[in-house]
Interface confidence: low
């Protein structure tokens, strides 16, 4: 449906607030170097503008896109060149080549530093003061540190910190209130931000289609009752609301979720039985809900899935006649009947019944050919359950920290090109795995397992596609989408690297270790066990577990000691001595 | 996008007849099998009958043998279901759906047989 004015259309859709928040997230995950100050001058000028075209759809500029508006206004920023070097350069092209040169330039790594948490009495009485740019402050520094971050769930964020504030700096202990609230937060937020981040990487690496199949497959899942043709319609809505979003669409986006949810809402009966109270919510909390509600029950009595795609004569006609559409029905009714198969493995097993078709009907016997297609869903069935039983048993044998440390060794003699901040972020979020998925039944641990993992992997690929060092990455992340993960199992130890130089430097440690939260600590013993195993590959487990028990008694012991820096000079020494005959450096 | 739009229920007395029709659009309607279902007040769903894409092949629930029969222009893109001898226990809504799905997407259309 056609407007006058996009921008007058949106923003009375959405509501100043919304409108002034979403521009806001989106200049922000363009631009983002510059500083809040600036980027709030500009929301600011774009929201009278808005007002403008409200009053009049008619006035000067207002029949302009979304995307024009806003890239003209970033446009304007005067340090473009000095700050950007050459984004500044999209300014001179036209949209949409101008928008997706932006896009182009967004950073999952930006060069920002790391958000320090003030004291409590500081930030409560930073939201008093002035509560409005204290939540502008946070979508601000969230959406340029998270440039791909999903904009409307954002908002839901925003509304989660407000509620926290407003709760705990009435409390009489703010801090006990507040803090568990902040790094749940945190904690969720980083999360979401890769589970988008995998979505927009999915739909611009992989295409529309890829999407598309990932949808069909999880929405079977979550909703097994409904029909195929509701299924499909729920995908394409879905397709187009991430597609805008992951596109820097977000007014748009916003407005499109916020349809569906309604949709999603109106035909409950026809869906799902579990909606019920994610329906009673106000929109934020209601889009989140849905998003994230359980699967619902099964319809009892399913036929088998062998006689419309194995044994009936018509497999090969309905398939050429309609190639999509009965693959997207396979994928539906395989998917519904299994909410304990990981998405990514109903789609490899779709991919291997679409390879059969393919093969088989320009064969001399069709049917024949594809008789045993079930036959080869077997072992892509249980690769994922074993490797998922072993590393469950490590978990529970580990724990957390050690299961983490044994990831790390395991990818580092993988892909030993990767630089240690990456390898440590991944494999800590790899070894998380344990704690998120090995406590649920067998029924529940795959698709809770191997769909972490193809997020994880993905923040392996992106962070990697920025500056590529290692071939075997580009490969498992380019190949397929959906056979990452067992590409980077089935990895061996790299024959062809070549250990880095020893260098004393690296291990060497001061006494602010000790002041470390107990997580920073472990970040700090895991970054020297990565270049411990990048100077020494073929360290064994034995070794290299030696080497960490005597750095942590090290530390245990230089934090405990009345001069620091002198036991952490002294004793230092002696550590990386020991270690390099221990480990023949 | 996938849609389907039944129509042609209404209140018949016993021993009466109607003939539903479900208008596919949004896909290859002549290359798949569809069915119909039925879903009465209070009840689960209900599988009704069954074609398949050509048209040759019929399946009918033992409660509708003999009395429903199931058919489908392709070219028109349209399903159709001729129920006669109808009975108060035949009250539902009733929905077409792809291939032999009890799930209910598309919204029905709703047969009441009563004297």
């Known amino acids: 449906d056609a407007h006058k004015s996009e921008v007058a259309h949106r923003f009375k859709d959405l509501g100043e607030e919304n409108f002034k928040a979403l521009v806001l997230i989106a200049f922000a995950q363009y631009l983002q170097q510059c500083p809040f100050e600036d980027h709030v001058k500009l929301v600011n000028e774009v929201t009278e503008f808005a007002k403008t075209c409200v009053a009049d759809e008619s006035a000067e500029n207002c029949d302009k896109s979304l995307h024009t508006l806003f890239g003209d206004k970033l446009c304007t920023v005067a340090t473009l060149r000095e700050t950007y070097g050459e984004m500044a350069d999209c300014c001179a092209k036209q949209e949409p080549e101008r928008n997706e040169c932006f896009l182009q330039h967004k950073d999952d790594n930006p060069n920002l530093p790391r958000l320090v948490r003030p004291e409590v009495d500081v930030m409560c009485t930073a939201f008093h003061d002035n509560e409005e740019t204290f939540l502008k402050k946070y979508l601000y520094e969230i959406a340029r540190r998270h440039p791909y971050f999903y904009a409307p769930e954002l908002l839901f964020f925003a509304k989660r910190y407000k509620a926290a504030f407003t709760e705990c700096c009435q409390a009489a202990d703010k801090a006990a209130c507040l803090l568990p609230k902040l790094d749940e937060l945190r904690d969720e937020g980083k999360a979401s931000s890769a589970k988008q981040r995998l979505k927009c990487a999915s739909l611009q690496k992989f295409g529309e289609r890829a999407f598309k199949a990932w949808a069909v497959a999880r929405l079977s899942q979550r909703f097994p009752k409904a029909e195929f043709a509701e299924v499909s319609k729920l995908v394409t809505d879905l397709t187009k609301v991430h597609t805008e979003c992951c596109h820097g669409d977000l007014l748009e986006c916003a407005d499109d979720r916020a349809d569906l949810a309604k949709y999603i809402c109106e035909n409950q009966d026809s869906i799902s039985s579990k909606l019920k109270e994610c329906c009673e919510k106000p929109l934020l909390e209601k889009s989140h809900c849905i998003a994230e509600v359980e699967n619902d029950e099964m319809p009892a009595d399913l036929p088998s899935l062998a006689a419309d795609f194995v044994e009936s004569k018509d497999v090969c006609k309905n398939y050429a006649e309609a190639k999509d559409v009965f693959l997207g029905m396979f994928l539906y009714e395989y998917a519904r009947r299994h909410p304990d198969y990981s998405v990514v493995l109903l789609l490899r097993l779709a991919k291997t019944y679409e390879t059969t078709l393919e093969k088989c009907c320009a064969a001399a016997d069709p049917h024949e050919c594809y008789a045993k297609v079930f036959d080869e869903f077997k072992p892509l069935v249980e690769e994922p359950q074993n490797l998922i039983k072993q590393n469950c048993e490590l978990f529970e044998q580990l724990g957390e920290y050690k299961f983490q440390n044994a990831l790390l060794v395991r990818y580092t003699k993988k892909v030993p090109q990767v630089s240690t901040p990456t390898l440590v972020e991944v494999s800590r979020n790899l070894g998380k795995v344990g704690s998120k998925c090995c406590k649920h039944p067998e029924a529940k641990r795959m698709p809770c397992a191997e769909d972490y993992l193809s997020v994880v992997l993905n923040q392996l690929c992106v962070l990697h596609e920025k500056t590529p060092v290692s071939d075997r990455v580009t490969k498992c992340c380019t190949e397929s989408l959906v056979n990452r993960r067992p590409c980077f199992s089935a990895l061996e130890v790299d024959e062809t690297y070549v250990p880095k130089e020893f260098n004393a430097e690296t291990f060497t440690f001061h006494a602010d270790i000790c002041t470390l939260s107990e997580k920073e600590r472990q970040i700090k013993k895991q970054t020297a066990l990565v270049e411990l195993v990048k100077h020494k590959p073929k360290a064994t487990k034995e070794q290299l577990k030696a080497v960490m028990d005597d750095f942590a008694a090290f530390v245990e012991k230089c934090c405990k000691a009345d001069d620091k820096e002198t036991c952490f000079a002294e004793e230092g020494k002696k550590l990386v001595a020991a270690s390099q005959a221990a480990l023949g450096l | 996008q996938v849609q389907l739009v039944e129509s042609g229920g209404g209140l018949v007395q016993p021993g009466g007849s109607l003939r539903l029709s479900c208008a596919a659009s949004?896909?290859?309607?002549?290359?798949?099998?569809m069915s119909w279902v039925r879903q009465a007040p209070g009840k689960g769903p209900e599988w009704v009958s069954a074609?398949?894409?050509?048209?040759?092949?019929?399946r009918y629930a033992e409660t509708v043998k003999g009395r429903f029969t199931i058919s489908r222009d392709n070219a028109k893109k349209t399903l159709y279901l001729q129920m006669n001898s109808l009975k108060p226990e035949d009250t539902a809504v009733y929905y077409c759906?792809?291939?032999?799905?009890?799930?209910?997407g598309s919204q029905g259309t709703q047969v009441t047989v009563s004297s």
């Open positions: 759906t792809i291939g032999r799905s009890t799930s209910r």
């Open positions: 949004g896909f290859s309607f002549g290359s798949f099998g």
């Open positions: 074609i398949d894409s050509g048209g040759a092949d019929t």
